[in-house]
């Protein structure tokens, strides 16, 4: 999948590790797609290094990336989304390393948003809802979501729930009474498209009611 140019001029350059990783985001800005790449070694001297993608493009042979600090990116409508593209790291006119990648297999969804938790007193449960921009998209519509929650004092004790809808019910009896909880959600492609987890949504914080001593039930907030 990846190859190094054999050229004496590049001897010094080839001592470096030019491994890189990329992710795509489809219809991230209207009908525009984006592709973001970065070197895996943060110490690579990127001064004269550029990225280029060729193949599986509409109307054009190749596209150049723009550089923003250590990140290289393209925003375009010209991804064919069928077959593999060749992504190369270049210095001058020489390719240092290339990878053949199908952009539909490196999709990173946009982070969910509008996460909220509503307590239902009568049902003794919490209804968790959130939104995703992918409901409106033509391509990456089907996602798996990972809802993670923890008691605020338990730094690393996250409970995870996977679901395909944007609504989840948490039973009150499964949570500690009179406790502050943090909850967040992320998404990953789940049908045809493959790739990576999105960034986490902003966290939402909620408090569970106290237990009502006479009935053994929690008091509403």
């Amino acid at each position: 999948e990846s190859g190094y140019a054999q050229n004496g001029d590049l001897e010094d350059a080839e001592l470096d590790d030019y491994s890189f990783s990329c992710y795509s985001q489809l219809e991230v800005n209207g009908s525009q797609h984006s592709l973001t790449c970065a070197f895996e070694d943060p110490d690579v001297n990127i001064t004269n290094l550029e990225f280029e993608i060729c193949g599986a493009l509409v109307e054009v042979k190749c596209l150049n990336f723009r550089k923003l600090q250590e990140i290289y990116f393209i925003e375009t409508k010209k991804f064919l989304l069928i077959g593999k593209s060749n992504i190369c790291v270049k210095v001058g006119e020489k390719s240092l390393t290339c990878k053949k990648i199908d952009l539909t297999t490196i999709v990173k969804p946009e982070a969910p948003f509008d996460l909220s938790v509503v307590y239902r007193e009568g049902a003794n449960d919490f209804v968790v809802t959130f939104n995703t921009s992918h409901l409106q998209k033509k391509y990456v519509k089907v996602l798996m979501h990972d809802v993670a929650y923890r008691q605020e004092k338990d730094e690393n004790k996250w409970t995870h729930v996977n679901l395909s809808s944007t609504k989840l019910t948490l039973l009150q009896r499964k949570l500690q009474p009179a406790a502050m909880y943090e909850i967040k959600v992320r998404s990953i492609p789940d049908h045809y498209f493959k790739g990576f987890w999105s960034e986490w949504s902003p966290s939402y914080y909620f408090r569970t009611p106290e237990i009502n001593n006479s009935s053994g039930e929690m008091d509403p907030i």
Epitope: G30, S31, Q32, E52, N64, K67, E93
Partner: antibody
Framework: QVQLQESGPGLVKPSETLSLTCTVS?????????WNWIRQPPGKGLEWMGY???????TYTPSLKSRITISRDTSKNQFSLKLSSVTAADTAVYYC????????????WGQGTTVTVSS | DIQMLQSPSSLSASVGDRVTITCLAS??????LAWYQQKPGKAPKLLIY???RLADGVPSRFSGSGSGTMFTLTISSLQPEDFATYYC?????????FGGGTKVEIK
């Protein structure tokens, strides 16, 4: 085959508004690309003025930002340039062209139309 | 704004000569550079894009090289139809800017 054709008055009075239209054939201005205006004063070099993107958003060169408007009529597959408060310095050949943004070129150009600013 | 300094501003050459025009960007622009040819009374014509790639239908005697800040357009063997003005242009950042042009005249 993509073709672009500029049209509009060849003479504009100082302080008035210059209006030009670019008619595109062989490609829809709503499909992709940026649709640009470039001008060239007599005997001088080229100056990029701005574009309207296929999505309808616009970007202008800062030196003209207060005077320039680029719009489009999708039903006629046209995009237009308006330049207000013109002076003799705006006398130039005006070109429309396709490209830029995610590609590093203007691949199709109109033949150009000469606009003279004079009373 | 990124300044594009083109040199020379004019040159005289004969048919068959090798001609080199340079374009120096005031800051690094990667491969975001194009070269155009313009003949009197005509619109510019794309020759080279992405600094080194030959546009469709352009003769192979034209070539582009460079990346970053220093770019070169070379005509390996000048033909009678190549006498024209040549411009470089950067697409790296707004406003997109052109070089001042190089007029190639018959010696």
């Amino acid at each position: 085959q993509v073709q672009l054709q500029e049209s509009g008055p060849g003479l504009v009075k100082p302080s008035e508004t210059l209006s030009l239209t670019c008619t595109v054939s062989g490609y829809s201005v709503t499909t992709d690309y940026a649709w640009n205006w470039i001008r060239q004063p007599p005997g001088k070099g080229l100056e990029w003025m701005g574009y309207i993107f296929y999505s309808g958003s616009t970007t202008y060169t800062p030196s003209l930002k207060s005077r320039i408007t680029i719009s489009r009529d999708t039903s006629k597959n046209q995009f237009s340039l308006k330049l207000s408060s013109v002076t003799a310095a705006d006398t130039a050949v005006y070109y429309c062209a396709r490209g830029g943004y995610d590609v590093n070129y203007f691949d199709y150009w109109g033949q150009g139309t000469t606009v003279t600013v004079s009373s | 704004d990124i300044q594009m300094l083109q040199s020379p501003s004019s040159l005289s050459a004969s048919v068959g000569d090798r001609v080199t025009i340079t374009c120096l960007a005031s800051q690094t622009i990667g491969y975001w550079l194009a070269w155009y040819q313009q003949k009197p009374g005509k619109a510019p014509k794309l020759l080279i894009y992405a600094a080194t790639r030959l546009a469709d239908g352009v003769p192979s005697r034209f070539s582009g090289s460079g990346s970053g800040t220093m770019f070169t357009l070379t005509i390996s063997s000048l033909q009678p139809e190549d006498f024209a003005t040549y411009y470089c242009q950067q697409f790296f950042s707004y406003p997109w800017t052109f070089g001042g042009g190089t007029k190639v005249e018959i010696k």
